[in-house]
């Protein structure tokens, strides 16, 4: 992290708390309107690399619900509705931060965790490896 | 959030702290190997809806660096390398959690914030609105 000079108006946190424990206000400030990804757009159906959204739920995690994309096809959908295997549907993945209850079941104690989620799919030209 | 019974081994947090303030250990547990998205795959270049990755930096936020995808074209790239404007490149967006220093410049006090980031692009069939 970036070293930031101590501000006298800040809550105190001693070195003994390393690995660093901080105070986090869970009253979320939302910079955008939160929506179920299925409603936010229909790209998952209109894409040439369409995907399904699967609900991943874990009460020990915050947020407890995460939507995971799974590409419907290995190839990409052409205008005529046929799937073209000269192209590949692949998941676009994003590393996100979540809060994991630690110790488990504790309502007020968390550890930051990075997890990899598939957000949607895109159509790519495959890398073909031929055998000599 | 889901109501979870108080466990006697948990840190204490009184109701006076609402909007709820919790303890978060910033020693991140990584469930996957963290990589620069540019290195993790070359989908951004091989996609029919290619994108560029822009570095968004903010020292008052954790993580301080976020990569934002911007679609290179309005249309989608065909096999011959030309852009097909009968199809559209669109950003796939994901709502993510970040920690915002609050009060500003304080190293140990944060508020959870949701922000919308573009992770990559996908090629979709456009919705055509015909004029009556």
């Amino acid at each position: 992290g970036i070293a930031i000079p101590r501000n006298s108006g800040c809550p105190n946190s001693e070195d003994k708390n390393f690995p660093r424990t901080v105070m986090v206000n869970l009253n979320i400030h939302n910079r955008n309107t939160s929506t179920n990804p299925k409603r936010s757009s229909d790209y998952y159906n209109r894409s040439t690399s369409p995907w399904n959204l699967h609900r991943n739920e874990d009460p020990e995690r915050y947020p407890s619900v995460i939507w995971e994309a799974k590409c419907r096809h290995l190839g990409c959908v052409k205008a005529d509705g046929n799937v073209d295997y000269h192209m590949n549907s692949v998941p676009i993945q994003q590393e996100i931060l979540v809060l994991r209850r630690e110790p488990r079941h504790c309502p007020n104690s968390f550890r930051l965790e990075k997890i990899l989620v598939s957000v949607g799919c895109t159509c790519v030209t495959p890398i073909v490896h031929h055998v000599a | 959030g889901i109501a979870i019974p108080r466990n006697s081994g948990c840190p204490n947090s009184e109701d006076k702290n609402f909007p709820r303030t919790v303890m978060v250990n910033l020693n991140i547990h990584n469930r996957n190997t963290s990589t620069n998205p540019k290195r993790s795959s070359d989908y951004y270049n091989r996609s029919t809806s290619p994108w560029n990755l822009h570095r968004n930096e903010d020292p008052e936020r954790y993580p301080s660096v976020i990569w934002e995808a911007k679609c290179r074209h309005l249309g989608c790239v065909k096999a011959d390398g030309n852009v097909d404007y009968h199809m559209n490149s669109v950003p796939i967006q994901q709502e993510i959690l970040v920690l915002r220093r609050e009060p500003r410049h304080c190293p140990n006090s944060f508020r959870l914030e949701k922000i919308l980031v573009s992770v990559g692009c996908t090629c979709v069939t456009p919705i055509v609105h015909h004029v009556a």
Partner: antibody, heavy 118, light 112 residues
Framework: QVQLKESGPALVAPSQSLSFTCTIS????????VHWVRQPPGKGLEWLVV???????TYNSALKSRLSISKDNSKSQVFLKMNSLQTDDTAMYYC????????????WGQGTSVTVSS | DVVMTQTPLSLPVSLGDQASISCRSS???????????LHWYLQRPGQSPKLLIY???NRFSGVPDRFSGSGSGTDFTLKISRVEAEDLGLYFC?????????FGAGTKLELN
Amino acid sequence: QVQLKESGPALVAPSQSLSFTCTISGFSLSSYGVHWVRQPPGKGLEWLVVIWSDGTTTYNSALKSRLSISKDNSKSQVFLKMNSLQTDDTAMYYCARDGYYIYTMDYWGQGTSVTVSS
Amino acid sequence: DVVMTQTPLSLPVSLGDQASISCRSSQSLVHSNGNTYLHWYLQRPGQSPKLLIYKVSNRFSGVPDRFSGSGSGTDFTLKISRVEAEDLGLYFCSQGTHAPLTFGAGTKLELN
């Protein structure tokens, strides 16, 4: 439990067309794809076509001009039409469920035998 | 099309023996998404094929643990640790990474 059952004529004259029906139970066609595969007597398996849950299709390009696949989700049926049959189309024809968009045929019908002969 | 070459075409065994079947593809079966779509099926005499192993090494539900799959890229192997009578039949490898989906010619597992 998951079941698939093929039906179609047992004997067809050369140059004629042929229609198969695969009737399924224990799963929904709106959630799973269905493949057609054939096996000539004493030989190996040849994949023909798949219709995916969203109605999109993938054909074996060698046979695409002679094949047509469709389905009726509400009736739990998949239909395959094959045109211009020749004697080398004599085979056991199977329909099979796709495991999860990964070309894994996890459940198969018992097959329907077709002989092309004059 | 991707050619799948199985060896041997015939494999005589005694009950309780270990059996090994090889499958080689004419091009890599690693998809752009990182997965390898190589599967194994068993067709017992007079029956339709049954899925044994999917994506190289995953046993399908109900498949005994004496069956195992391994390999990567273009070279794959199915092993049966102790052959039982119900294991006799025709084994096919199949790839789904590239269209059209293709099968190997089959390996007949039979008694000595």
